[in-house]
């Protein structure tokens, strides 16, 4: 997995006028890292992990940069011509990556009302847009505005690419996010599903990186995909991830089943505990 820094900025308009303030979220290596609230941008580290990245540092630089980006995006939204009644959103996502071979990638993407309409490779400065006519109209509109804006020159796009990578390298220097491995905690629970059946759920939490295998085995052999239900692998706010897998089995057969977990080259197996069945809401 490459190291990545992702900026996600959102501005809103209501009945034709752009609202003040904006929402900014920054993800570092896929983890929520910084956040600015709508009215007053004050970069807030997302959890202890984010605070640890740069220690006691104040986040003035990040606040200044995000505020400037938010202002630019509000101006862009003001120039979009098809402002119909009601609430609309313009979202800019900018991502830069450093791969293991030290190669880099940078891109930015624009979304209007949640729909992608314009992308740019910040290294080649090549623009791409979806085929739909609405997306193309929006894209031309925004591209023309960005070209008109003296700030949005060739130098500007190069700077966006360089700045993103510079910030990413600075964060990585902290060592907190460097290629660490945190093994998961695994917990197996059982709950009543229907007459004679129970649902067994295996939860893995607190692991990093996000790649994990979690599955149920019966008598030592993996169950087929269609007999299991998986949850998404989600950030848990501590710089680590969580996920789950569940399956429905006959009551009394519990001992034949094992949750198998594999993470970063290591595995473990987790049987179903004995005892009373918990009456929990089923995932099914």
């Amino acid at each position: 997995e490459p190291h990545s820094l992702r900026y996600n900025l959102t501005v809103l308009s209501g009945d034709g006028s752009v609202q003040s303030g904006f929402l900014a979220e920054v993800h570092l290596d896929g983890q929520p890292f910084l956040r600015c609230d709508r009215q007053k941008c004050r970069a807030k580290p997302q959890g202890q992990w984010a605070e640890d990245v740069l220690g006691n540092k104040t986040w003035d630089r990040e606040t200044r940069d995000l505020t400037g980006n938010g202002k630019d995006l509000r101006m862009t939204l003001a120039h979009i011509k098809d402002q119909k009644e009601g609430l609309h959103s313009l979202q800019e996502i900018r991502v830069c990556e450093i791969h293991e071979d030290n190669s880099t990638r940078s891109s930015q993407h624009f979304y209007y009302d949640g729909e992608l309409f314009l992308s740019q490779n910040l290294e080649t400065e090549e623009w791409t847009m979806p085929q739909s006519s609405r997306a193309q109209t929006l894209a031309m509109n925004v591209r023309n505005f960005l070209k008109e804006d003296a700030m949005k020159t060739k130098t500007h796009y190069h700077a966006m690419h360089a700045d993103c990578l510079q910030e990413l390298r600075r964060y990585l220097k902290s060592g907190v996010v460097l290629r660490r491995t945190v093994p998961p905690m695994v917990n197996v629970t059982r709950s009543e599903a229907s007459e004679g059946n129970i649902t067994v759920t295996c939860r893995a939490s607190g692991f990093y990186p996000w790649n994990i295998t979690l599955s149920w085995r019966q008598d030592g052999v993996s169950l087929s995909h269609d007999t299991q239900q998986w949850g998404d692998v989600l950030p848990d706010g501590n710089g680590t991830y969580q996920t789950w897998v569940a399956t429905r089995i006959c009551q009394g057969e519990e001992q034949r089943f094992t949750c198998y977990m594999e993470h970063s080259g290591n595995h473990s197996t987790h049987p179903v505990p004995s005892g009373k069945v918990l009456v929990l809401q089923s995932h099914w």
Partner: antibody, heavy 117, light 107 residues
Framework: QVQLQQSGAELVRPGTSVKVSCKAS????????IEWVKQRPGQGLEWIGG????????NYNEKFKGKAILTADKSSSTAYMQLSSLTSDDSAVYFC??????????WGQGTTLTVSS | DILLTQSPASLSASVGETVTITCRAS??????LAWYQQKQGKSPQLLVY???TLADGVPSRFSGSGSGTQYSLKINSLQPEDFGSYYC?????????FGGGTKLEIK
């Protein structure tokens, strides 16, 4: 029928390494985890660790980390255990076994390792 | 780590007798306990798994019982081929430890 055929007895010098093999037959090799167990002369049994032959992922007893390395070759349906920096404490019979869920159902015949100068 | 304490360490009995071997765990192992028999120079053979399920081909004179932290293996009407060593092993959480073993000898 399920069989786990282990390599023959080894007599090795202290400080060297040895690689014990365990060839599986009679079932789909990648479906089941393979475990390794140590038995010192006249002593009880000790779990060393296990490997998933399908992915190569491992699970070691903390006590044997740095001593044993478990690997598997899918093409030959063979699991291996390499033991390094051998001392007389490593002289033992080593068993491979198949994990059938929450118990070990099948065992290899054992490989006797003697470490002596 | 869960410690399994097996008793007795050795036992002398006659053919036809009934014997019981016990295995005490240092924590709840939720019935994830197996019993093995081992003859001199051979590999262990599974007798009982999940505390009380008899493995295929194991004579019905063998039976396992227990729950929580206390488990036992009972052999009714001992036969000459039953003499050897017996081990319990848990599968609740790694490391999967074994009991110290019980050596069953002919009286």
């Amino acid at each position: 029928q399920v069989q786990l055929q282990q390599s023959g007895a080894e007599l090795v010098r202290p400080g060297t390494s040895v690689k014990v093999s365990c060839k599986a037959s009679g079932y789909a090799f990648t479906d089941y985890l393979i475990e390794w167990v140590k038995q010192r002369p006249g002593q009880g049994l000790e779990w060393i660790g296990g490997i998933n032959p399908g992915s190569g992922s491992t699970n070691y007893n903390e006590k044997f980390k740095g001593k044993a390395i478990l690997t598997a070759d899918k093409s030959s349906s063979t699991a291996y255990m390499q033991l390094s920096s051998l001392t007389s404490d490593d002289s033992a019979v080593y068993f491979c076994a198949r994990l059938d869920g929450n118990y070990v159902g099948y065992w290899g015949q054992g490989t006797t390792l003697t470490v002596s100068s | 780590d869960i410690l399994l304490t097996q008793s007795p360490a050795s036992l002398s009995a006659s053919v036809g007798e009934t014997v019981t071997i016990t295995c005490r765990a240092s924590g709840n192992i939720h019935n994830y306990l197996a019993w093995y028999q081992q003859k001199q120079g051979k590999s262990p053979q599974l007798l009982v798994y999940h505390a009380k399920t008899l493995a295929d081909g194991v004579p019905s004179r063998f039976s396992g019982s227990g729950s929580g932290t206390q488990y036992s293996l009972k052999i009714n009407s001992l036969q000459p081929e039953d003499f050897g060593s017996y081990y319990c092993q848990h599968f609740w959480s790694t490391p999967w430890t074994f009991g110290g073993g019980t050596k069953l000898e002919i009286k």
